[in-house]
C-alpha cells in the first residue's frame, strides 16, 4: 500500500511570505504525487511549485492560495491512488487605503460646529486594530469632542472647530502587520492664529552617502514657530545639531538637508509648527535607505518556432522600486521589434530556431543591480526511431506495440485506440520511450491502434492492427455463490468462448447425476420447482479440441427471500422528546437490519449518544431536534437479497396550551408516547 | 489469527549491539509493514522504526545513526539492531503490524514484548 | 516532530464517574489521532483510531472527540476495570508519537 510519511497540515501563513505544505510517500514501486486545490489540481507556476514530493510557495497569496489542498499519490503501475489529509492556510494580510470623508458628503459642506466623519480604508486579516492620527499625533478615544469607533474603522468628530483642523491619517495592526493610510485627508476650519499646513514633508529614500532634503511650511496669523526633530525627540538646529547629525542644515523656509546620508541617520524626521493659538502640528516624514534583494530563479522554457511568447520578469523587492530591462547576448533589447521588452516582460515574436539562448533580467534602483538568467529552447517535430507494427496478440497476456521516436525536446506520446484516447489505468501502460503496454489483452482488443508523438513544434502519428487469439473462458464466469428462492422456478445459465465454439455441460460436484426436475439446456441449468436438497456445489464444464476444457464450481443456496413483519410508520414527534421508528424483518439467511437517514447510512459505531439502533431493528432518536426531520429508510438484507421500507419522522415545537385548555387537551397532532429529557 | 512474538537476550552491556528477532504468522511481510517500539520502565512508548513491504526503512531520527531493521520474508522474520547502547536503552520491546492503510496507522496488533536490560 | 502533551498525568476516580482526558498537537493533524489503554505487564490495547471511531469489542463507554489539534477521551460511566495508563498517538506524520500518558487510579 501507498503510506504517506508526512502529510500536510493546515498552518498560519503571511501573505507575500514563504510557505511550505509537506508530503513524504513510501510505496513498493514508483509513484507519481501531485495536489489538489479544491480538488482541482494544482498547476506548478514561479511561485507556487512541487518541491519534490512537496508543495512549496514563493510568496503566499490570499486570493489564489485560499482553500483545500490535498497530496495525491498515484501508483501508474497498479492504479492505486491515496489522497493525504486536508490541509488549508490561515492567510494573515493587511492592505492599504485612503482616509475618506464619510459625513458630510462634501467638503465644501463642512462648517464650524458640524460633525464631521472620516473613514479608514485600509483592511485586513485578522480584523486590524485602527488608530487616527492627526498631524502625526495619536487621537485616543475618550478626548475632547472626537468618537474613535474601532469597529466601524471611522473618527467622528462632534462638534468640529479649529482646533480640529489639520491632517488626518490612521494607521492599522495587526497579528500579520502594520500599514498606514496611503492618501491622508486636509480638515481646514479656519482659525488664522492656528498653524496650518502649507508644505508637508514627504518619505526619501537615498543611496548611502547621497543627499536628501526634507520641506516644511506652516502659515499663521502671527507667523507660526518651526521645529525639526530626529527619532530621540533631539531638536535639530544649525547651532546645535546632535552627534549623528552633524551634516544636517536647516533652511530660513524651514527644509532640512542632510548631507553624506549613512544607515543611522535613517529614521523618522517631526517637523512642529506652534501657532499663536491651538495645538502644535507635527508632520512625520522616514528617511530611507536605498536597498535591493535577489531576484528569483527562472524555469527554463521551452517555445516553437513561428509563435509568440512572453516570459515575465518579476522585479525584486527593493526601495526604491527597481527599473527592469532585458539583454541577450550583452545587448538591451529595444521596446519594439520582433524580439523586445514591454513593461518587464520580454516578448519574442514570430520565434526563430536562432532565438534559442540564454536572456537575462536586469533589475536596477539607486541600492545597486541584480540579474537572472532564463534558458529558452526552440522546440523541433519529432522524427521515427520505430513504428508501431501489426501484431498478434494472446488474449490474457501482455501486449506491446513500440511508438519510438526522437525530438527537443523530449516528445509526449500518446495513443488512440478506434480513435479514442487511452488514458493510463490498470490495464493500460505508455512507457517513457512511448511504447504501449496492454497488461491483460482482452478480445474487445482487437482493433486499430494509432500512436502520436509531439513536442510543442508539432507531431507525427502512425497505425497499427491488433488480431487477439481469444482464449477458451467463460463469457461471463457463473457467479461462485448464486441464491434461489425456495419452491420457485429457478434457472442457472453458463456460457463460454473460444476459438472454435465449445461444448457446455453442467454436473453436481460430487459427481453425481442431475436429479429428473432438474435440466441441462445447452449450458442452462434449469430447476422446475426449488426444493433445499437442491442447495449445494454444480460445475460447469466447457471444452473444444484444440483447446480442451475449462470448470466454473457454483455453490448454489437456498433462501426464503425477505419480508417485513414490522415497517416504520409516519411519525411526528415534539422536539426534545424520544422517536421510536420500529423495523423487523425476516427471511433465511436471517436478515440484517441497517438504517439510511436523511440519503446517509446511520453507521452503528458512529451514531453518538443521542441515537440508537436496536437488536431487533429498531431505531431510537433521544431528544430530536428540528434537524432531525426527514425520511428514515430501514433496509434488511441478507447474502441473497435486499429490501427496504421508508417513513417519514416531522419534529415539532410543542403548543403553548390557551387558558382555556385543560392538562387533559389533545395535543393538535397524532404523536407518538415519549420520554421527555430535561437540560440541566 | 494474527501474531507477533518478540525474541532476544534479556541481558545486553552497554556499548555492545542489542539484537532482536520478530517472528510473525497469521500474514505475510510482502504485504504489510512492521513497527519496533519501545518502553522504558514507568515511561510512554517511544516509536523506533519500521520497514516496509518493499523492504526500505523509516527510522526514529533521535536514533537514526544507531538503529538498523532488516527481515527474511521466507522465514516471517524482521530483526532490529540498536548499537552503542546505554542504560538508556533499557525498555520493553514490541514489534507491531502496520495495519496496512496510506497513513502512520493504528497499531491493533502487539506483540507481548520482551525486557531487555542493558548492564554490565 | 509532532510533540503529543496529555493532561493530566494522574487521575484518581470513584466508579460510575465520568472521566475525561485531553490530548494536543504541537501543530494540526486533522483526526488522525489514536488512544490506547495499558494495563501493567500487558502490551498496549487500541480504543479509538482516527479520533472518534470506536473499536469492535471495546466498551461503548469509550468514545473519542475532537480535531485539529485538541482532542478528547471519554470514560462515561468507569468500571473498576478501567484503571490503567491511558496515551494517545499522533497518526498524521512519521515518526509516530505518543503522549506522555494519564495513569487513571480507582478510588
Known amino acids: 500500500a501507498i503510506v504517506f510519511i508526512k502529510q500536510p497540515s493546515s498552518q498560519d501563513a503571511l501573505q507575500g511570505r514563504r510557505a511550505l505544505l509537506r508530503c513524504e510517500v513510501e510505496a513498493p514501486g514508483p509513484v507519481h504525487v501531485y495536489w489538489l486545490l479544491d480538488g482541482a489540481p494544482v498547476q506548478d507556476t514561479e511561485r507556487r511549485f512541487a518541491q519534490g514530493s512537496s508543495l512549496s510557495f514563493a510568496a503566499v497569496d490570499r486570493l489564489q492560495d485560499s482553500g483545500t489542498f490535498q497530496c495525491v499519490a498515484r501508483d501508474d503501475v497498479t492504479g492505486e491512488e491515496a489522497r493525504s489529509a486536508n490541509a488549508s492556510f490561515n492567510i494573515k494580510w493587511i492592505e492599504a487605503g485612503p482616509v475618506v470623508l464619510k459625513h458630510p458628503a462634501s467638503e465644501a459642506e463642512i462648517q464650524p460646529q458640524t460633525q464631521v466623519t472620516l473613514r479608514c480604508h485600509i483592511d485586513g486579516h485578522p480584523r486590524p486594530t485602527y488608530q487616527w492620527f492627526r498631524d502625526g499625533t495619536p487621537l485616543s478615544d475618550g478626548q475632547s469632542n472626537h468618537t474613535v469607533s474601532s469597529k466601524e474603522r471611522n473618527l467622528t468628530l462632534r462638534p468640529a472647530g479649529p482646533e480640529h483642523s489639520g491632517l488626518y491619517s490612521c494607521c492599522a495592526h495587526s497579528a500579520f502587520g502594520q500599514a498606514c493610510s496611503s492618501q491622508n485627508f486636509t480638515l481646514s476650519i479656519a482659525d488664522e492664529s492656528f498653524a496650518r499646513v502649507v508644505l508637508a514633508p514627504q518619505d526619501v529614500v537615498v543611496a548611502r552617502y547621497e543627499e536628501a532634503m526634507f520641506h516644511c511650511q506652516f502659515s499663521a496669523q502671527p507667523p507660526p514657530s518651526l521645529q525639526w526633530l530626529f527619532e530621540d525627540e533631539t531638536p535639530i538646529t544649525n547651532r546645535s545639531r546632535p552627534p549623528h547629525l552633524r551634516r544636517a542644515t536647516v533652511f530660513a523656509n524651514g527644509s532640512l538637508l542632510l548631507t553624506q546620508v549613512r544607515p543611522r541617520n535613517a529614521g523618522i524626521y517631526r517637523c512642529i509648527g506652534q501657532g499663536q493659538r491651538g495645538p502644535p502640528i507635527i508632520l512625520e516624514a522616514t528617511l530611507h535607505l536605498a536597498e535591493i534583494e535577489d531576484m528569483p530563479l527562472f524555469e527554463p522554457r521551452v517555445f516553437t518556432a513561428g509563435s509568440e511568447e512572453r516570459v515575465t520578469c518579476l522585479p525584486p523587492k527593493g526601495l526604491p522600486e527597481p527599473s527592469v530591462w532585458w539583454e541577450h547576448a550583452g545587448v538591451r533589447l529595444p521596446t519594439h521589434g520582433r524580439v523586445y521588452q514591454k513593461g518587464h516582460e520580454l516578448v519574442l515574436a514570430n520565434i526563430a530556431e536562432s532565438d534559442a539562448g540564454v536572456y537575462t533580467c536586469h533589475a536596477a534602483n539607486l541600492a545597486g543591480q541584480r540579474r537572472q538568467d532564463v534558458n529558452i529552447t526552440v522546440a523541433t517535430v519529432p522524427s521515427w526511431l520505430k513504428k508501431p507494427q501489426d501484431s498478434q496478440l494472446e488474449e490474457g497476456k501482455p501486449g506491446y506495440l513500440d511508438c519510438l521516436t526522437q525530438a527537443t525536446p523530449k516528445p509526449t506520446v500518446v495513443w488512440y485506440r478506434n480513435q479514442m484516447l487511452i488514458s493510463e489505468d490498470s490495464r493500460f501502460e505508455v512507457f517513457k520511450n512511448g511504447t504501449l503496454r496492454i497488461n491483460s489483452v482482452e478480445v474487445y482488443d482487437g482493433t486499430w491502434y494509432r500512436c502520436m508523438s509531439s513536442t510543442p513544434a508539432g507531431s507525427i502519428e502512425a497505425q497499427a492492427r491488433v488480431q487477439v487469439l481469444e482464449k477458451l473462458k467463460f463469457t461471463p464466469p457463473p457467479q461462485p455463490q448464486q441464491c434461489m428462492e425456495f419452491d420457485k422456478e429457478a434457472t442457472v445459465p453458463c456460457s463460454a468462448t473460444g476459438r472454435e465454439k465449445p461444448t457446455i455441460k453442467w454436473e453436481r460436484a460430487d459427481g453425481s447425476s442431475l436429479p429428473e426436475w432438474v435440466t441441462d439446456n445447452a449450458g442452462t441449468l434449469h430447476f422446475a420447482r426449488v426444493t433445499r436438497d437442491d442447495a449445494g456445489n454444480y460445475t460447469c464444464i466447457a471444452s473444444n479440441g484444440p483447446q480442451g476444457q475449462i470448470r466454473a464450481h457454483v455453490q448454489l443456496t437456498v433462501a426464503v427471500f425477505i419480508t417485513f413483519k414490522v415497517e416504520p410508520e409516519r411519525t411526528t414527534v415534539y422536539q426534545g422528546h424520544t422517536a421510536l421508528l420500529q423495523c423487523e424483518a425476516q427471511g433465511d439467511p436471517k436478515p440484517l437490519i441497517q438504517w439510511k437517514g436523511k440519503d446517509r447510512i446511520l453507521d452503528p459505531t458512529k451514531l453518538g449518544p443521542r441515537m440508537h439502533i436496536f437488536q431487533n431493528g429498531s431505531l431510537v432518536i433521544h431528544d430530536v431536534a428540528p434537524e432531525d426531520s426527514g425520511r428514515y429508510t430501514c433496509i434488511a438484507g441478507n447474502s441473497c437479497n435486499i429490501k427496504h421500507t421508508e417513513a417519514p419522522l416531522y419534529v415539532v415545537d410543542k403548543p403553548v396550551p390557551e387558558e382555556s385548555e385543560g392538562p387533559g387537551s389533545p395535543p393538535p397532532y397524532k404523536m407518538i408516547q415519549t420520554h421527555h429529557h430535561h437540560h440541566h | 489469527q494474527v501474531q507477533l512474538q518478540e525474541s532476544g537476550p534479556g541481558l545486553v552491556k552497554p556499548s555492545e549491539t542489542l539484537s532482536l528477532t520478530c517472528t510473525v504468522s497469521?500474514?505475510?511481510?510482502?504485504?504489510?509493514?512492521v513497527y519496533w517500539v519501545r518502553q522504558p520502565p514507568g515511561k510512554g512508548p517511544e516509536w523506533l522504526g519500521v520497514i516496509w513491504t518493499s523492504g526500505n526503512t523509516n527510522y526514529n531520527p533521535s536514533l537514526k545513526s544507531r538503529l538498523t531493521i532488516s527481515k527474511d520474508n521466507s522465514k516471517n522474520q524482521v530483526s532490529l539492531k540498536l548499537s552503542s547502547v546505554t542504560a538508556a536503552d533499557t525498555a520493553v520491546y514490541y514489534c507491531?503490524?502496520?495495519?496496512?492503510?496510506?497513513?502512520?496507522?493504528?497499531?491493533?496488533?502487539w506483540g507481548q514484548g520482551t525486557l531487555v536490560t542493558v548492564s554490565s | 516532530e509532532i510533540v503529543m502533551t496529555q493532561s493530566p498525568d494522574f487521575q484518581s476516580v470513584t466508579p460510575k464517574e465520568k472521566v475525561t482526558i485531553t490530548c494536543r498537537a504541537s501543530q494540526s493533524i486533522s483526526d488522525y489521532l489514536h488512544w490506547y489503554q495499558q494495563k501493567p505487564d500487558q502490551s498496549p490495547k487500541l480504543l479509538i483510531k482516527?479520533?472518534?471511531q470506536s473499536i469492535s469489542g471495546v466498551p461503548s463507554r469509550f468514545s473519542g472527540s475532537g480535531s485539529g489539534s485538541d482532542f478528547t477521551l471519554t470514560i462515561n460511566s468507569l468500571e473498576a476495570e478501567d484503571a490503567a495508563t491511558y496515551y494517545c498517538q499522533n497518526g498524521h506524520s512519521f515518526p509516530p508519537t505518543f503522549g506522555q500518558g494519564t495513569k487513571l487510579e480507582i478510588k
Open positions: 507491531v503490524k502496520h495495519d496496512g492503510g496510506n497513513y502512520v496507522g493504528v497499531m491493533n496488533y
Open positions: 482516527y479520533a472518534s
Open positions: 497469521g500474514f505475510s511481510l510482502t504485504s504489510y509493514g
